[in-house]
């Protein structure tokens, strides 16, 4: 709130309560107990005439305040700017239900500039005014005042003048400033066309059409026309003058873009500095050339910086969990200046003896959320083989990677999946059968899934049906089972163990011991 009042060129002030010398002397109803004229001091110790009311205790408040008569000076639409402070009812204990946080704004058109009384029924409501969230904090000397500013418009007006009125319905409020003004569209040069001073139309939708003329060295796209809107702003809905590509408006003329600048199209924009990592070497450039090693993607606008592929991802961390691997990494140090970065995962299965002999993992491996086009910096890879060397490469790619593929864009890690329990043994054979013993042999499991630590042979008499069994363990792929009963059917199962545990037992092998002391050599799955 200041003493000197500066307003926009398109506003003509009809009333400014801050400019009134001495008391405002507006009419209040009721005369006492309602609106009250109170002086507050501004930062220059000059009194500001305000109107205040704070009747928040009593319900059904109806306090009116009316301005003096305001001439409209031929304006058909006027604007009312109210600066006010409105107290939050929450800061007033015990007034729920009676305290309000709004007031009402009214007007009344009249040719009579000396009406002495407020006749409420003559007034037309403009709006209910509330304190919005966006208040201004204004220094009043060494104090702070929260000022809300609200603007409303009224029209079309037809009589010589009008009165404004403020109705309080139970708020705690101070009107600090009331300003009434109308708008005009001032003389302007816009878009290389000149338009004369023009008075606004009658209502919010009325536009006054004005034809403009192009300045030198510009081309007419369409006939330049502007419309003077009711808010005093020039509008350009159709037609304009434009500088050619490679040229810009400077000092009201269209001049060639300077070296290092460009303009791609015939628009009313100014020449733009060449985007980062690009240059122009002549005046009047319509685009800029990318620096060496930098590129533009097909869908990049001329205004976008030239960019490059990203550097390699950083800090690749692997976490092996049996036959799954979780990979996590950090964004590249250099994204190439682009936002469209994504990541691709390459999986290679490598031989234990020669890690350089790697081949693609194939379709059996699964990636979560996906293998290519990852937007996150982590991936989970499952369905790997146990106890196997894998190399994973994480490639960072962006919209210009295809123009300059570069191995630096990837980071790799080699991991070995954990040992797992071995698969079951496919073939168990009885190599030698006697009255009291059976010699067994078997093959290593198809998938050892680690280092085989030992084999476990479980056997029992067939008619015992596994109710009573014995266990023999051996590191070899064969064993002699002794102490058997003659002429008895035995069932044998074998399983392998790695550090990760036992595999499944083999299919049962049924063998019957001999009655005579000779040896039977067998190599079938079921010796009898």
């Amino acid at each position: 709130v200041t003493g000197s009042r500066v307003y926009p060129a398109n506003e003509v002030t009809l009333l400014d309560s801050r400019s009134v010398q001495g008391e405002l002397g507006w009419i209040a109803s009721p005369l006492e107990g309602g609106w009250e004229e109170v002086s507050i001091m501004d930062e220059k110790n000059t009194p500001i005439r305000t109107y205040q009311v704070c009747n928040v205790m009593e319900p059904s408040q109806n306090n009116w305040l009316r301005t003096d008569w305001i001439t409209r000076e031929g304006a058909q639409r006027v604007y009312i700017e109210i600066k006010f402070t409105l107290r939050d009812c929450n800061s007033l204990p015990g007034v729920m239900g009676t305290c309000k946080e709004t007031f009402n704004l009214y007007y009344y058109e009249s040719d009579n500039d000396k009406e002495r009384f407020i006749r409420e029924n003559q007034f037309v409501k403009i709006d209910t005014i509330a304190a919005d969230e966006s208040f201004t904090q204004v220094d009043i000397g060494d104090r702070i005042m929260k000022l809300n500013t609200e603007i409303r418009d009224v029209g079309p007006l037809s009589k010589k003048g009008f009165y404004l009125a403020f109705q309080d319905v139970g708020a705690c409020i101070a009107l600090v400033s009331v300003r009434v003004f109308y708008k005009k569209c001032p003389l302007t040069v816009r878009n290389l066309a000149q338009f004369p001073d023009t008075i606004t139309g009658a209502d919010t939708s009325s536009l006054v059409e004005v034809r403009g003329s192009c300045v030198n060295n510009s081309e007419e796209k369409d006939v330049p026309k502007m419309y003077c809107g009711a808010d005093g702003e020039w509008l350009v809905p159709i037609g304009n003058c434009l500088c050619n590509a490679g040229h810009e408006e400077r000092s009201g003329e269209c001049q060639a873009c300077k070296i290092g600048y460009y303009k791609a199209l015939s628009t009313d924009a100014t020449c733009a500095k060449c985007p980062p990592h690009s240059y122009s070497v002549w005046e009047g450039a319509t685009s800029c050339t990318c620096d060496r090693g930098f590129f533009r993607a097909d869908n990049d606008a001329a205004s976008m910086p030239c960019t490059r592929p990203p550097s390699a991802p950083l800090n690749l961390i692997s976490n092996v969990n049996e036959t799954s691997v979780n990979l996590e990494w950090s964004s590249p140090q250099n994204t190439g200046g682009r936002q469209d970065i994504s990541y691709n995962v390459v999986c290679k299965k490598c031989g234990a003896g020669d890690p350089s002999k790697c081949r693609p993992c194939g379709s059996g491996v699964h990636y979560t959320p996906q293998q290519n086009g990852l937007k996150t910096t982590k991936v989970s890879i499952t369905d790997l083989l146990a106890h196997t060397n894998y190399t994973f490469e994480i490639w960072a790619v962006n919209g210009v990677s295809k123009y300059n593929p570069n191995p630096d864009q990837s980071v790799s890690v080699t991991v070995t999946t954990n040992q797992a329990a071995p698969s079951s043994i496919a073939l168990v054979q009885a190599k030698e059968v006697t009255r009291y013993s059976v010699a067994l042999a078997w093959l290593e499991p198809d998938r050892p899934n680690g280092v085989i630590l030992e084999y476990e042979v479980k056997y029992y008499e067939k008619d015992q049906n596994e109710r009573s069994y014995r266990i023999v363990r051996t590191a070899a792929r064969n064993t002699d089972i002794k102490g058997l009963n003659p002429l008895t059917s035995y069932v044998f199962h074998v399983r392998a163990r790695t550090a990760a545990g036992y595999g499944d037992f083999s299919e049962p092998l049924e063998v019957t011991t001999n009655t005579v002391p000779s040896r039977i050599i067998g190599d079938g799955a079921n010796s009898t």
Partner: antibody, heavy 121, light 106 residues
Framework: QVQLLQSGAEVKKPGASVKVPCKAS????????MSWVRQAPGQGLEWMGW????????TYAQGFTGRFVFSLDTSVSTAYLQISSLKAEDTAVYYC??????????????WGQGTLVTVSS | EIVLTQSPATLSVSPGERATLSCRAS??????PAWYQQKPGQAPRLLIY???TRATGIPDRFSASGSGTDFTLTISRVEPEDFAVYYC????????FGQGTKVEIK
Amino acid sequence: QVQLLQSGAEVKKPGASVKVPCKASGYTFTSRAMSWVRQAPGQGLEWMGWINTNTGNPTYAQGFTGRFVFSLDTSVSTAYLQISSLKAEDTAVYYCARVRLTVYGDGMDVWGQGTLVTVSS
Amino acid sequence: EIVLTQSPATLSVSPGERATLSCRASQSVSSNPAWYQQKPGQAPRLLIYGLSTRATGIPDRFSASGSGTDFTLTISRVEPEDFAVYYCQQYGPSWTFGQGTKVEIK
């Protein structure tokens, strides 16, 4: 002339109750809230709360809930402060004061002369 | 709850001198405190409220200023009748008083 008239001094025993009246005159009683303020001997002012004289809705400050009750009789423009289960530490001058509300800040613009309540066995 | 701290506890001044009383809030407040004067055996009297508005009948030698957390009551030229205890009071959903500053004759 706007006035708030309070009753004379009261001497009460611990555990008793006291009801201090505050009679308003010279303005519309229901248009302004009434505050109550306590001042113990040789001490500063303590705001106890206020009552909306229009709705009868009371607001109590911290430490003044439970034993303290604000009430009204608008027919005789009187506000009351009742204190029950009196304790020795309730000994103080109790003031009623009319509340002046404005958008820029509040105050208590008219005060009663105060009622001294002494609690002693 | 906002705590108001007044300083000094006692201020010794001679008649005709300027007296400056301080009131500091424990946290920033959006409003100015009210100021009261209390003489021995009397009820407090409202001096200033709102945007440093003097209450009815208060002479213009009393003025208030400040914002945020630091507020000041100034008596430009102390008169004999001004020797009393002065309290600041913050408004809001809960009101609080400062502990008071006693202005005494030097």
